[in-house]
Interface confidence: medium
């Protein structure tokens, strides 16, 4: 159906509240430096305009595209040149180039300080005083820090945030109620951001085909009773939704996501037996519930894979006449039978199967050539299984902090040119895989670990792309999406690295270290560890363990001293000298 006014269409479909929230998110993701008040004003003006167009579709400018309307609005911002430099040049361009230009200026690492919550009483007063403004500020702060956040999901988290405050601001001990709930929500939000960034990178760097393959594998595992036609339909729609959100088309994205949820609920009999309770919820919760829904049980009568993909004499005909459909069917059939495999592994197996057919279908006797193809998957399956087993054993031995340090050492040696903050951030996140996945049953470990690692390594790739410093990181990031993790795992110590000059300033600590929260204290110590390794890349694990032990004792001692600052300035240089001597 063609609409006279696109903006009126989206306003009517989404409703005023969601429309305004999405516009605020869109502007905050584009102009990450602008103050909240400016964005509120812009969002209000666009929402008023949309409302007018909904009342009279043939009104002035109502027929303009959303990109034109949004871009024109962004280009009215007075401080564009001062705050964003060459982003202001985007305004000289015409659509669609102007929007592409804005997208290219999104900053994955804007460097804003971490959000620090004020006192619970002050928070509750602000919440009760103006709930809409309070939640708008939440949307703004998350969106500007995470310019690729999945917008409809952010609206859902804002709703959760509202629920937390509605409950905890009535509680006797507000702080005790808010603390754990806000922290749990924060963890979910950070993971959600990283997952969507991975999806956007898949689409932007590797194209629709890569994203569709990933989605076919994931959804086939989750909905093994659905047939391939049904999975394909959902994957096609889901691809459109994520392409729109990754491309900054948040209104279309949220609208299409709601349509997809509606479709899944209307067709749940042919998708999954687990959708029932999701489908009784309102739209935001419904979509979220469907995205997180538990896996359906496998059908009991699945025939052997070999019948269709190895023993059938028509395999090469099937493959050559419609490669993507045939490989998609293979991926679907393999994934629904193997919920315990990671999506990355399933995609590697499909790639291996494809390579085998490419080779064998060109020979005189294809069936003999591909007869053992399924057996050849074994090493591909063993590799992540062994990796997870080894690393979970290490995690259980060292605990999360110790495991993070082991990974810090490992990754600094692989890519010492990468900036210290990036190495610390990525290694800390990689280390969380232990906490997240190693406690799970054997049947869920690999899927949990490898797919989480893919998301975290994508963060490394995104940050590294902004300032490329290591050819090997560029190579692992750009050659193959599904082989990124094995590529990084396979990197050895970079022997070409020239050690960094020693800088005493890097190893100078002050009394403010003592008052930092535990996580920030860890970051300081881990920063020192990376810098130490960059200075002495040949240091052994034993030597590093000794130095880090000494460092921990030094911090503990000085933080317990009467004159903390005096202790740091006196004992610090001694520690550094001892460390240098120990690492000769």
């Amino acid at each position: 159906e063609a609409y006279k006014s696109e903006i009126a269409h989206r306003y009517n479909d989404l409703g005023e509240e969601h429309f305004r929230g999405l516009v605020l998110v869109a502007f905050s993701q584009y102009l990450q430096q602008c103050p909240f008040e400016d964005h509120v004003k812009l969002a209000k003006e666009v929402t008023e305009f949309a409302k007018a167009c909904a009342a009279e579709e043939s009104g002035a400018n109502c027929d303009k595209s959303l990109h034109t309307l949004f871009g024109d609005k962004l280009c009215t911002v007075a401080s564009l040149r001062d705050k964003y430099g060459d982003m202001a040049d985007c305004c000289e361009k015409q659509e669609p180039d102007r929007n592409e230009c804005f997208l290219a200026h999104k900053d994955d690492n804007p460097g804003f300080p971490p959000l620090v919550a004020p006192e619970p009483d002050a928070l509750c007063a602000a919440f009760q005083d103006n709930e809409q403004l309070f939640l708008g500020k939440y949307l703004y702060e998350i969106a500007r820090r995470h310019p690729y956040f999945y917008a409809p999901e952010l609206l859902y988290y804002a709703q959760q945030y509202k629920g937390v405050f509605a409950e905890c601001c009535q509680a006797a001990d507000k702080a005790a109620c808010l603390g754990p709930k806000i922290e749990a929500l924060r963890e979910k939000v950070l993971l959600s951001s990283a997952k969507e960034r991975f999806k956007c990178a898949s689409l932007q760097k590797f194209g629709d085909r890569a994203f569709k393959a990933w989605s076919v594998a994931r959804l086939s595992q989750r909905f093994p009773k659905a047939d391939f036609a049904e999975i394909s339909k959902v994957v096609t729609d889901l691809t459109k939704v994520h392409k729109e959100c990754c491309h900054g088309d948040l209104l279309e994205c949220a609208d299409d996501r709601a349509d997809l949820a509606k479709y899944m609920c209307e067709n749940q009999d042919s998708i999954s037996t687990k959708l029932k309770e999701c489908c009784d919820k309102p739209v935001l919760e419904k979509s979220q519930c469907l995205a997180e829904v538990e896996r359906d049980e496998l059908p009991g009568d699945l025939p052997s894979l070999a019948a269709d993909f190895v023993e059938d004499k028509e395999v090469c005909k099937n493959y050559q006449e419609a490669k993507d459909v045939f490989l998609g069917t293979f991926l679907y059939e393999y994934a629904r039978r193997h919920p315990e495999y990671s999506v990355s592994l399933l995609l590697r197996l499909a790639k291996e199967y494809e390579a085998t057919l490419e080779k064998c279908c060109a020979t005189d006797d294809p069936p003999t050539c591909y007869a053992k193809v399924l057996d050849e998957f074994k090493p591909l399956v063993d590799e992540p299984q062994n990796l997870v087993k080894t690393n979970c054993e290490l995690f259980e031995k060292l605990g999360e902090y110790g495991f993070q340090n082991a990974l810090l050492v490992r990754y600094t040696k692989k890519a010492p040119q990468v900036s210290t903050p990036t190495l610390v951030e990525v290694s800390r996140k990689l280390g969380k895989v232990g906490t997240k996945c190693c406690k799970k049953p054997e049947s869920e470990r690999m899927s949990c670990a490898e797919d989480f690692l893919s998301v975290v390594l994508n963060r490394l790739c995104v940050l590294h792309e902004k300032t490329p410093v290591s050819e090997r990181v560029t190579k692992c990031c750009s050659e193959s999406l599904v082989n990124r993790r094995p590529c990084f795992s396979g990197l050895e110590v970079d022997e070409t690295y020239v050690p960094k000059e020693f800088n005493a300033e890097t190893f100078t600590f002050h009394a403010d270290l003592c008052t930092l929260p535990e996580a920030e204290k860890q970051v300081k110590k881990q920063t020192a560890l990376v810098e130490l390794l960059k200075h002495k890349p040949k240091a052994t694990d034993e030597q590093l363990k000794t130095v880090m032990g000494d460092f921990g004792a030094f911090v503990e001692k000085c933080c317990a001293a009467e004159n903390k600052e005096g202790c740091f300035s006196e004992e610090g240089p001694k520690l550094v000298a001892a460390a240098q001597a120990a690492l000769v």
């Epitope: 036609a229 269709d308 028509e314 099937n318 459909v325």
Partner: nanobody, 126 residues
């Protein structure tokens, strides 16, 4: 669930023609791999022709190649088998089978088809 209903069988002289139909309900026929099989008295079910779902890749048994044509009409949700130059050895009950979830792959193995019609008898005799 897929329900299938065959029709169009009958008595025909050698060299004659017949067109069998298989109407499907419960699933779109273009999303499903479908095939015609036949079963002569005292014999097993034998593959005759098949067509993949989503993409029209057709398959024929060697014994019917050049004489039989499989096709489908998605708007009518119906599968057809056009049989020309019929021979006495083509006499059998003809069944259509469907494999949802395998859109491309038409197997020649009857056991891999979960859904079947009740069959229509074709007799070729003078």
């Amino acid at each position: 669930e897929v329900q299938l209903l065959e029709s169009g069988g009958g008595l025909v002289q050698p060299g004659g023609s017949l067109r069998l139909s298989c109407a499907a309900s419960g699933r779109y026929i273009d999303e499903t791999a479908v095939a015609w099989f036949r079963q002569a008295p005292g014999k097993g079910r034998e593959f005759v022709a098949g067509i993949g779902g989503g993409v029209d890749i057709t398959y024929y048994a060697d014994s019917v190649k050049g004489r039989f044509t499989i096709s489908r009409d998605n708007s009518k949700n119906t599968l057809y088998l056009q049989m020309n130059s019929l021979r006495p050895e083509d006499t059998a009950v003809y069944y259509c089978g469907a494999r949802p979830g395998r859109p491309l792959i038409t197997s020649k193995v009857a056991d891999l088809y979960p859904y079947w019609g009740q069959g229509t008898l074709v007799t070729v005799s003078s």
